[in-house]
């Protein structure tokens, strides 16, 4: 049902990385506008993105209140210029999103190697602890703050002269690895949440190699 001029939204999709969370949908509006509502399973509906002609709505501010909650959104369709108009059943057309649990489903953003330092045959590689939009006591939390030991990093490292990638893992943001003296190595890291079944891995960080400015070499 609904007015002859409105169509229900469809293909409602959550796009979320490091908790920055946007709901997207189709179609591009023709003579209609949208309003989005979001709620937890047990909570009240809250309206966002009022009467918009966009087909996306940033819901980050709502989901970061409790990233372990499960959220549901719905998108209402209204005739443009007549938002009071409703469908034949007395309600505007709307479509529900899939459920979304940020802690379990947000994609892990591409990590960054902050630095690496070689001392003799040991290299310490440090991963940047990315800031999220999740707040506690008015402070933005880092990815490590939010996920704790649920988050690990996998380091891939290889001699510049070879292709085989050795791996190391850490449940902190630092690696200490053994390397061969006199060899240059390249590094890439991947964030992983092993306890997940989907979205377990991030994309790989940009590759950093020894002899570039991020690193420091100390012969002892």
């Amino acid at each position: 049902s609904g007015t002859t001029n409105t169509v229900a939204a469809y293909n409602l999709t959550w796009k979320s990385t490091n908790f920055k969370t946007i709901l997207e949908w189709e179609p591009k509006p023709v003579n209609q506008v949208y309003t989005v509502q979001i709620s937890t399973k047990s909570g009240d509906w809250k309206s966002k993105c009022f009467y918009t002609t966009d087909t996306e709505c940033d819901l980050t501010d709502e989901i970061v209140k409790d990233v372990k909650q499960t959220y549901l959104a719905r998108v209402f369709s209204y005739p443009a210029g007549n938002v009071e108009s409703t469908g034949s059943a007395g309600e505007p057309l709307y479509e529900n999103s899939p459920e979304f649990t940020p802690y379990l489903e947000t994609n892990l953003g591409q990590p960054t190697i902050q630095s690496f330092e070689q001392v003799g045959t040991k290299v310490n590689v440090t991963v940047e602890d990315e800031r999220t939009l999740v707040r506690r006591n008015n402070t933005f939390l880092s990815l490590r703050d939010v996920f704790g030991k649920d988050l690990i990093y996998t380091l891939y490292y290889w001699k510049s002269s070879s292709s085989g990638k050795k791996t190391a893992k850490t449940n902190t943001n630092e690696f200490l690895i053994d390397v061969d003296k006199g060899e240059n190595y390249c590094f890439s890291v991947q964030a992983v949440i092993p306890s997940r079944t989907v979205n377990r891995k991030s994309t790989d960080s940009p590759v950093e190699c020894m002899g570039q400015e991020k690193g420091e070499f100390r012969e002892i």
């Epitope: 690990i152 996998t154 891939y156 292709s163 085989g164 990638k165 050795k166 791996t167 190391a168 893992k169 850490t170 449940n171 690895i177 053994d178 991947q190 992983v192 092993p194 306890s195 079944t197 989907v198 979205n199 377990r200 891995k201 790989d204």
Partner: antibody
Framework: EVQLVESGGGLVQPGGSLRLSCAAS????????IHWVRQAPGKGLEWVGY????????YYADSVKGRFTISADTSKNTAHLQMNSLRAEDTAVYYC?????????????WGQGTLVTVSS | DIQMTQSPSSLSASVGDRVTITCRAS??????VAWYQQKPGKAPKLLIY???FLYSGVPSRFSGSRSGTDFTLTISSLQPEDFATYYC?????????FGQGTKVEIK
């Protein structure tokens, strides 16, 4: 239910080639890592190599480097072990195993194995 | 590569016995050590991970411990289904390496 099923084993002459497959179900290989481990008759376990199907990164044991290649077909949720220039000492049961990828757990699920015999 | 030296290579024991198998790493591997059980013609099965954690579904008579670079698998009271070969493995560095195995036989 997580399952790994190897196939493609058989008898091959020295210098020959063989391609083993590891079909995974119950999980998505690109979200994990796949290892190959072999066991010569009456001997212990020997690690062969791994692949991260997400980015294609691999690493091999020195004993097979340059002769064996691990690949993954994420659309078919399958990993492969291409074995070239086979030698008698490559005769073994070949297992694929899932790497859970955590700081604490590595090889949590294994296939049943497939026997490769290199003999003239 | 890190060597994992496992001992004994075989042992004979009776049902109800307490059995201890040890593995020594050639260098520090933190707690990145697993223990597997393998029966003839079958794939290895994970028993213990991270040196001392019991894997899901594994009977509590199995336990693991670490002292420096020495790792121990203990079966507190051997059962008939425990007669098998046991392997330790380190995954602290690439390549991962296995111990030579310990065959537990019926006395």
């Amino acid at each position: 239910e997580v399952q790994l099923v190897e196939s493609g084993g058989g008898l091959v002459q020295p210098g020959g080639s063989l391609r083993l497959s590891c079909a995974a179900s119950g999980f998505t290989i690109s979200q994990y890592w796949i290892h190959w481990v072999r066991q010569a008759p009456g001997k212990g376990l020997e690690w062969v190599g791994y692949i991260d199907p997400y980015n294609g990164y691999t690493y091999y044991a020195d004993s097979v480097k340059g002769r064996f290649t691990i690949s993954a077909d994420t659309s078919k949720n399958t990993a492969h072990l291409q074995m070239n220039s086979l030698r008698a000492e490559d005769t073994a049961v070949y297992y694929c195993a899932r790497d859970y990828g955590s700081f604490r757990v590595q090889l949590d699920y294994w296939g049943q194995g497939t026997l490769v015999t290199v003999s003239s | 590569d890190i060597q994992m030296t496992q001992s004994p290579s075989s042992l004979s024991a009776s049902v109800g016995d307490r059995v201890t198998i040890t593995c020594r790493a050639s260098q520090d591997v933190n707690t990145a050590v697993a223990w597997y059980q393998q029966k003839p013609g079958k794939a290895p099965k994970l028993l213990i991970y991270s040196a001392s954690f019991l894997y899901s579904g594994v009977p509590s008579r199995f336990s693991g411990s670490r002292s420096g670079t020495d790792f121990t698998l203990t079966i507190s009271s051997l059962q008939p289904e425990d007669f098998a070969t046991y392997y330790c493995q380190q995954h602290y560095t690439t390549p991962p390496t296995f111990g030579q195995g310990t065959k537990v036989e019926i006395k």
